[in-house]
């Protein structure tokens, strides 16, 4: 079956000089489009017909998915985190086999005291979330644990988390040096063996808005870029207005092509415009209209 769609057009001239028709208003021109079954041949760039309209894939939009969007939604996480794998040796508790069983009363009591102690140690670190014991073993008690850090996402989140991990190292080194046994007695909440303190590994959330932007822009990856507004990243093409990288098309319309952003210059009743940015206006010669 054939579908007849009325479309209005206005004359636009690309900056290279060719005249292009784009949808506008007023003059109706019939356009025929063949529809085979429920598959609309008009859906371009991987779009598919849902029975009513074309469903377009990022970064395309439009009736036929032929146009490229000016901005792509990228969603950085609300928060980002780091996990530090640490080992400390507690000397104020003697190891017993029950400590290996995470559901035992021994483990629960040890976990409670150890958590309280670490909460005191790291109390000045705003990124500090808590500790999680992963393993307890003989020697007196060797405590393998994770220190969890979290912060709000900002463009500088890596620096913030890197700084926090450094402070964690300083604080755990300090407490395990200062809180030590005297004559087999500990007067602190917990005592440590100074030499048993080790940082095994640090894992930081990896989020790169530039990478997400490039991936979603697909074949237009070279022309989309990330700009920040109120610490939030935006994935934009030069056709998106209001950013530092925005292209000013003056008397024209910005359009993305596989060669990048270009200006399609308008022709009005009195002028036609040309130039890369459609900023060169030429006045049309006057002629009389007969009514």
């Amino acid at each position: 079956p054939l579908a007849t769609i009325p479309v209005s057009t206005t004359s636009l001239t690309s900056s290279e000089g060719s005249t292009i028709s784009t949808p506008s208003v007023d003059i109706s021109t019939p356009v025929t489009t063949s529809i085979v079954g429920d598959q609309c041949s008009r859906c371009k760039n991987g779009g598919f017909w849902d029975g009513l309209k074309c469903q377009c894939l990022t970064p395309y939009y439009g009736e036929s998915c032929e146009e490229v969007v000016n901005s792509i939604d990228i969603a950085p996480p609300e928060t980002v985190s780091a996990q530090m794998e640490l080992t400390v040796t507690v000397t104020s508790v003697k190891f017993t086999d029950e400590l290996k069983n995470h559901s035992s009363q021994e483990f629960r009591e040890f976990n409670k005291t150890f958590t309280e102690q670490m909460n005191i140690v790291y109390s000045g670190i705003p990124e500090y979330v808590g500790v999680n014991i992963t393993n307890l073993r003989l020697g007196s008690v060797v405590v393998e644990h994770d220190v969890l850090l979290r912060t709000k996402y900002t463009p500088e989140y890596k620096t913030a988390l890197d700084n926090a991990t450094e402070v964690v190292k300083q604080k755990i080194t300090k407490v395990t040096t200062e809180q030590i046994m005297t004559n087999d007695n500990c007067s602190a909440l917990m005592c440590f063996n100074t030499t048993g303190t080790q940082v095994q590994n640090i894992t930081v959330t990896q989020y790169d808005p530039v990478e997400e932007c490039r991936q979603k822009a697909e074949e237009y990856e070279d022309y989309f870029l990330v700009e920040y507004r109120d610490q939030k990243p935006y994935c934009i093409s030069p056709c998106e207005s209001g950013f530092n990288a925005s292209k000013n098309c003056n008397h024209g319309k910005c359009q993305m092509s596989q060669n990048g952003a270009r200006c399609l210059c308008v022709t009005t009743e009195t002028h036609w415009y040309s130039g890369e940015d459609c900023n060169q206006g030429t006045q049309k010669s006057h002629h009389h209209h007969h009514h």
């Epitope: 000397t91 003697k94 021994e106 009591e109 309280e116 046994m181 087999d184 007695n185 007067s187 909440l189």
Partner: nanobody
Framework: EVQLQASGGGSVQAGGSLRVSCAAS????????WGWFRQRPGKEREAVAL???????FYADSVKGRFTISQDNTKNTLYLQMISLRPEDTAMYYC?????????????????WGQGTQVTVSS
């Protein structure tokens, strides 16, 4: 879960003796650590005498030679024998326990507490 009940406190003249007791309910009496702490008016709670299941014991310097900690596993009871009592021994005495084999004098590391028994020594 360990529950502790202290008793045996009272008033005594300087140089006198007292034995305070702490009855424990629960099946954990044979393992872990047990101790006596005291709190004098306006002061922090302090360790007096502590014992662990591996044989470790601690006595505060001020009570050495005068106080003895002991336990009777058959009765699930902890004792503190106090002789040659001094006015400065006047305090509320608390028994404490942990299922952990502890070496710490810090009361915050001890998870189970009795309600306390008052000892008053007058000159």
């Amino acid at each position: 879960e360990v529950q502790l009940q202290a008793s045996g406190g009272g008033s005594v003249q300087a140089g006198g003796s007292l034995r305070v007791s702490c009855a424990a309910s629960g099946d954990t009496f044979s393992r872990g650590s047990w101790g006596w702490f005291r709190q004098r008016p306006g002061k922090e709670r302090e360790a007096v005498a502590l014992i662990s299941s591996d044989g470790w014991t601690f006595y505060a310097d001020s009570v050495k030679g005068r106080f003895t900690i002991s336990q009777d596993n058959t009765k699930n009871t902890l004792y503190l024998q106090m002789i040659s009592l001094r006015p400065e021994d006047t305090a509320m005495y608390y028994c404490a326990a942990s299922v952990l084999v502890l070496r710490t004098l810090n009361p915050k590391a001890w998870h189970h507490w009795g309600q306390g028994t008052q000892v008053t020594v007058s000159s």
